[in-house]
Amino acid sequence: EVEKTACPSGKKAREIDESLIFYKKWELEACVDAALLATQMDRVNAIPFTYEQLDVLKHKLDELYPQGYPESVIQHLGYLFLKMSPEDIRKWNVTSLETLKALLEVNKGHEMSPQVATLIDRFVKGRGQLDKDTLDTLTAFYPGYLCSLSPEELSSVPPSSIWAVRPQDLDTCDPRQLDVLYPKARLAFQNMNGSEYFVKIQSFLGGAPTEDLKALSQQNVSMDLATFMKLRTDAVLPLTVAEVQKLLGPHVEGLKAEERHRPVRDWILRQRQDDLDTLGLGLQGGIPNGYLVLDLSMQEALS
């Protein structure tokens, strides 16, 4: 807490300008009017204040706006934003995407801080849903943003927003998240033709059900092994050898290198060995010839 001291004669600030960097902390406290600071916040970022001086300016704004800063001040905070605590930010009502961008810019190049997480949370809650422009902005600054959301939060993403998602934005998503995103992507890209559709849907396929994978296998998509390895095991298991061969196209040869890893390992265990042999890859571990395969899940469904 800075002591209340009278402003020395002739030092009362008439505007926010560079002369203030020569003020001591107590002079800034005594000589800068908080209302003047609030109306001229856009100038602060161009003036090389020390961190200690910025603390004083924040203190002045906190006194002026105990219930939280108005957006007119927030959008011009610049590096003063780095001085804010999540508690401060929870008092804000940020509705403008431009304000959000300005503050994210300040934190650019750093990990998502608790301040930024709180800011994004306030912004998205205020908007009610994660619209395309917001998602575009957030993933541009934080590619992993989407995968940091819970499946419940992801359910508020409208299908139209999926167009803003880049493959790298999904790198850290787990199957539960892809389960929510895949149907939205399918809806978003439904009017695209085969090859274009596959390019767009590919990064979401970790959430695809068996029937969609079967449908893709009929379209000469040549799925790469990296994508195949990210598919849900339960979605891959029912695929026949012929379907997997069609799905992977020339990439089918890569199965040999992955035969000990899921989902390939589990899929091999479900196939007849003579079907696997038709691939000519030397895949081992299939069901020996002459064995009867009982699909217990089907039996349960019938009883």
Epitope: E15, D17, E18, S19, I21, F22, N45, A46, I47, P48, T50, G78, Y79, E105, V106, K108
Partner: antibody
Framework: QVQLVQSGAEVKKPGSSVKVSCKAS????????ISWVRQAPGQGLEWMGN????????NYAQKFQGRVTITADESTSTAYMELSSLRSEDTAVYYC????????WGQGTLVTVSS | DIALTQPASVSGSPGQSITISCTGT?????????VSWYQQHPGKAPKLMIY???SRPSGVSNRFSGSKSGNTASLTISGLQAEDEADYYC?????????FGGGTKLTVL
Amino acid sequence: QVQLVQSGAEVKKPGSSVKVSCKASGGTFSSHAISWVRQAPGQGLEWMGNIMPIFGVANYAQKFQGRVTITADESTSTAYMELSSLRSEDTAVYYCAREMRLAYWGQGTLVTVSS
Amino acid sequence: DIALTQPASVSGSPGQSITISCTGTSSDIGHFNYVSWYQQHPGKAPKLMIYSVISRPSGVSNRFSGSKSGNTASLTISGLQAEDEADYYCASFTFPSLVFGGGTKLTVL
């Protein structure tokens, strides 16, 4: 809008002094720093020092300490840079620039030091 | 006053993006958020392109952007144009002095 107009080119003898002026118009003169930056032929920019006219406080780069004097006259909105004990390596274009971020620049003054 | 370190030259083709780095120390670039970038065409005075690491003065194209990570600041120019060919200087303000980088010559191929 802000404009900075500098004095004309100078040719000086080694050991002498030169005083370059920079007249500002537009905006508030007193409350914005005026910096002096020089550039030797084919070389980069070199910050020499600055002054905050309202306080008359000047700060100098270590390299020029004791050889340069920066002053400001608020009544005419003019800043001055005087460099003494000139040597041939001081041959350069000398610029004044306003604001700490050097937002506005003068046209430059060529100072040639030659015997 | 130790100069900041910039590459002597960079080049790029029209339409491409290029990035110029500016490396300082934890007591200048690393500690303060006051890095500026200047563009200088031959025979002309420098022009402020970026200040306070990321801010653009009005009138400067949004093809120019700044960023900072640790002790290194960067200037990125996207959609390179012929008129971008110039010398670029970074500068860092540490109260009450300022220090420049050695400059980078950008060539548009």
